[in-house]
């Protein structure tokens, strides 16, 4: 058993049929010595008396808010949560496996630039009685500070019969140099509590590996005389690291109809303009990627050909 | 200890092309190592990230773009003195800081070159003959060093009398290649910045 936060404790249980469970001793936070009784949750049934209560925690029915009272007055609470371990593996029931970039990816993180700011998100089908708490650091043995905000519900989607909820959090490395060469990864730890179930999820990455620029901005078209060709120009996204001559991007320019199966024109360039062949009912799209370290491409920025 | 906006002569900054080739070569070599050594811990997640130039050179700091010198987090206290001549310095107006930066890059390349050559000598003794260093990568390091054209003491190639541990050597190769790729990215950024200045 360990303390998650004040008056909240996590009991780690090996989860299998007829498991013995864990013996837990609760102590009432009071100078009082006698006349103390214990109850669980909203029940008025007295579980025991005395300053300490010893319980055998085996299942979720044994978890919950234990309260010690004296003469009708509440003295203190202890909330017990369960963390299940099945076949030596901690449970991952609360969050959905996003399977990208690989299986068992519960947390996904992205950074728009090298400033040390990044966003992580996760998915769940659970809608109520759910709380998250996020901590982060650079490195684990001698951790350097990363400050994370509160996790918030950022999107709701319908997937078949299920509703899916996306939560996200923004974090900022306390003293980040955009030009630095990372040798210690960022560690992100998410504590998830659903009702009386506790789970924790972690992700470890270098900012350079989670870079995904914003789409290029200000796409403009200029038809070329006596030609099917169009000159398309754009600018670096505002959120990208500066100076741009140091943090350079490369671009992919594509002309395509509405269907992915349609024919297309595609060209790659390090410049902020390109010449492509425009077709009726097609769109010109441009996306960006770090020129020197191939992490993710940005989303497409698009304009219609006409 | 940063790069002011220098004004090299018109035309291609001589080292940009070489630095692009360097990044390509080390990326290809790293990809080859990952594929060939698939049963060794050779991915970014699996290896320890070590920098053999740590406390010996200060390329990131010496080559910091002017725009980042206002960022306190970028101003490391490490100071290193370097020799200040070099053929990539295409203009007389080139500052002392730029010379410091380029000479730090040269020292990086020299250290990696020695490490890679020592390692290759060991890998050539491996009866499995599983992996060797790409001669193209070694040639590209050499070309960039020549383009930088700094005079400095030659570092003797390390020779080891004991029987090499090929497993450890291959893991060290992965560690070196990952670190060198990151440094090659920095070098490419620096050359691109200087070329644009």
């Amino acid at each position: 058993i360990w303390e998650l936060k004040k008056d909240v404790y996590v009991v780690e249980l090996d989860w299998y049929p007829d498991a013995p469970g864990e013996m837990v001793v609760l102590t009432c936070d009071t100078p009082e010595e006698d006349g103390i009784t214990w109850t669980l949750d909203q029940s008025s049934e007295v579980l025991g008396s005395g300053k300490t209560l010893t319980i055998q925690v085996k299942e979720f029915g044994d978890a919950g808010q234990y309260t010690c009272h004296k003469g009708g007055e509440v003295l203190s609470h202890s909330l017990l949560l369960l963390h299940k371990k099945e076949d030596g593996i901690w449970s991952t029931d609360i969050l959905k496996d996003q399977k990208e970039p690989k299986n068992k990816t519960f947390l996904r993180c992205e950074a728009k630039n090298y400033s040390g700011r990044f966003t992580c998100w996760w998915l769940t089908t659970i809608s109520t009685d759910l709380t998250f708490s996020v901590k982060s650091s650079r490195g684990s043995s001698d951790p350097q500070g990363v400050t994370c905000g509160a996790a918030t519900l950022s999107a709701e989607r319908v997937r078949g019969d299920n509703k899916e909820y996306e939560y996200s959090v923004e974090c900022q490395e306390d003293s980040a140099c955009p030009a630095a060469e990372e040798s210690l990864p960022i560690e992100v730890m998410v504590d998830a509590v659903h009702k009386l179930k506790y789970e924790n999820y972690t992700s470890s990455f270098f900012i350079r590996d989670i870079i995904k620029p914003d789409p290029p901005k200000n796409l403009q078209l200029k038809p070329l005389k006596n030609s099917r060709q169009v000159e398309v120009s754009w600018e670096y996204p505002d959120t990208w690291s500066t100076p741009h001559s140091y943090f350079s991007l490369t671009f992919c320019v594509q002309v395509q109809g509405k269907s992915k199966r349609e024919k297309k024109d595609r060209v790659f360039t390090d410049k902020t303009s390109a010449t492509v062949i425009c077709r009726k009912n097609a769109s010109i799209s441009v996306r960006a990627q770090d020129r020197y370290y191939s992490s993710s491409w940005s989303e497409w920025a698009s304009v219609p050909c006409s | 200890r940063n790069l002011p906006v220098a004004t090299p002569d018109p035309g291609m900054f001589p080292c940009l092309h070489h630095s692009q080739n360097l990044l390509r070569a080390v990326s290809n070599m790293l990809q080859k190592a990952r594929q060939t050594l698939e049963f060794y811990p050779c991915t970014s997640e699996e290896i320890d990230h070590e920098d053999i130039t740590k406390d010996k050179t200060s390329t990131v700091e010496a080559c910091l773009p002017l725009e980042l010198t206002k960022n306190e987090s970028c101003l490391n206290s490490r100071e290193t003195s370097f020799i200040t001549n070099g053929s990539c310095l295409a203009s007389r107006k080139t500052s002392f800081m730029m010379a410091l930066c380029l000479s730090s890059i040269y020292e990086d390349l020299k250290m990696y070159q020695v490490e890679f050559k020592t390692m290759n000598a060991k890998l050539l003794m491996d009866p499995k003959r599983q992996i060797f260093l790409d001669q193209n990568m070694l040639a590209v390091i050499d070309e960039l060093m020549q383009a930088l054209n700094f005079n400095s003491e030659t570092v003797p190639q390390k020779s080891s009398l004991e029987e090499p541990d090929f497993y450890k050597t291959k893991i060290k190769l992965c560690i070196l290649l990952h670190a060198f790729r990151i440094r090659a990215v920095t070098i490419d950024r620096v050359m691109s910045y200087l070329n644009a200045s």
Partner: antibody, heavy 118, light 107 residues
Framework: QVQLVQSGAEVKKPGSSVKVSCKAS????????LHWVRQAPGQQLEWMGW????????EYAPKFQGRVTITADESTSTAYMELSSLRSEDTAVYYC???????????WGQGTLVTVSS | DIVMTQSPLSLPVTPGEPASISCRAS??????LHWYQQKPGQAPRLLIY???QSISGVPSRFSGSGSGTDFTLTISSLQPEDFATYYC?????????FGQGTKVEIK
């Protein structure tokens, strides 16, 4: 299986014209760009131009502009390349090639040898 | 027009040995570079597109690398069927242009 089948070899006199055909099978004809590329004996490949069979849009290499005409007949899934004012240096194997991507070629015809000789 | 220069023009190789063919563009073309193989009396065949992207059905011993002006086609271990002429082609701008070709011959 996508295939491009070209018309047979031709012998032409200088100053005349030649029209080579390229019939496509497999896949929808208008879903692909169609190009013509030639190769003189022992020489490198030389791109001549492309057509979008969907709308008849064409683009030609400046070297052949005014001398080459590329057309397409959607009803027969056939593209044509006509080269006029032939000279001896136009002796070459003419290939049609196609792709959903405009700028490179993933399926090629077998080639048509055009010999220009007096 | 962008001029593509291949080297060497002729490359004698022992079967089983690796081979590398270089292609240089007269100006930067990013990764807009494609490789083809041509055997005598046959049409070219696409091997690699956009500098390094492999084509399904093409053996994995063929790989491409490069960007900007310098590109390389590598055959990791030459098989008897690989003796042919190889062409690079740029698609950065029209007109599309090819290299002169590199003939890989049996040593």
């Amino acid at each position: 299986q996508v295939q491009l089948v070209q018309s047979g070899a031709e012998v032409k006199k200088p100053g005349s014209s030649v029209k080579v055909s390229c019939k496509a099978s497999g896949g929808t004809f208008s879903d692909y760009y169609l190009h013509w590329v030639r190769q003189a004996p022992g020489q490198q490949l030389e791109w001549m131009g492309w057509i979008d069979p969907e709308n008849g849009d064409t683009e030609y290499a400046p070297k052949f502009q005014g001398r080459v005409t590329i057309t397409a007949d959607e009803s027969t899934s056939t593209a044509y390349m006509e080269l006029s004012s032939l000279r001896s240096e136009d002796t070459a194997v003419y290939y049609c090639a196609r792709n959903k991507e405009l700028r490179y070629f993933d399926v090629w015809g077998q080639g048509t040898l055009v010999t220009v000789s007096s | 027009d962008i001029v593509m220069t291949q080297s060497p023009l002729s490359l004698p190789v022992t079967p089983g040995e690796p081979a590398s063919i270089s292609c240089r563009a007269s100006q930067s073309i990013s990764i807009n570079l494609h490789w083809y193989q041509q055997k005598p009396g046959q049409a070219p065949r696409l091997l690699i597109y956009f500098a390094s992207q492999s084509i399904s059905g093409v053996p994995s011993r063929f790989s491409g690398s490069g960007s900007g002006t310098d590109f390389t086609l590598t055959i990791s271990s030459l098989q008897p069927e690989d003796f042919a002429t190889y062409y690079c082609q740029q698609s950065n701008s029209f007109p599309l242009t090819f290299g002169q070709g590199t003939k890989v011959e049996i040593k």
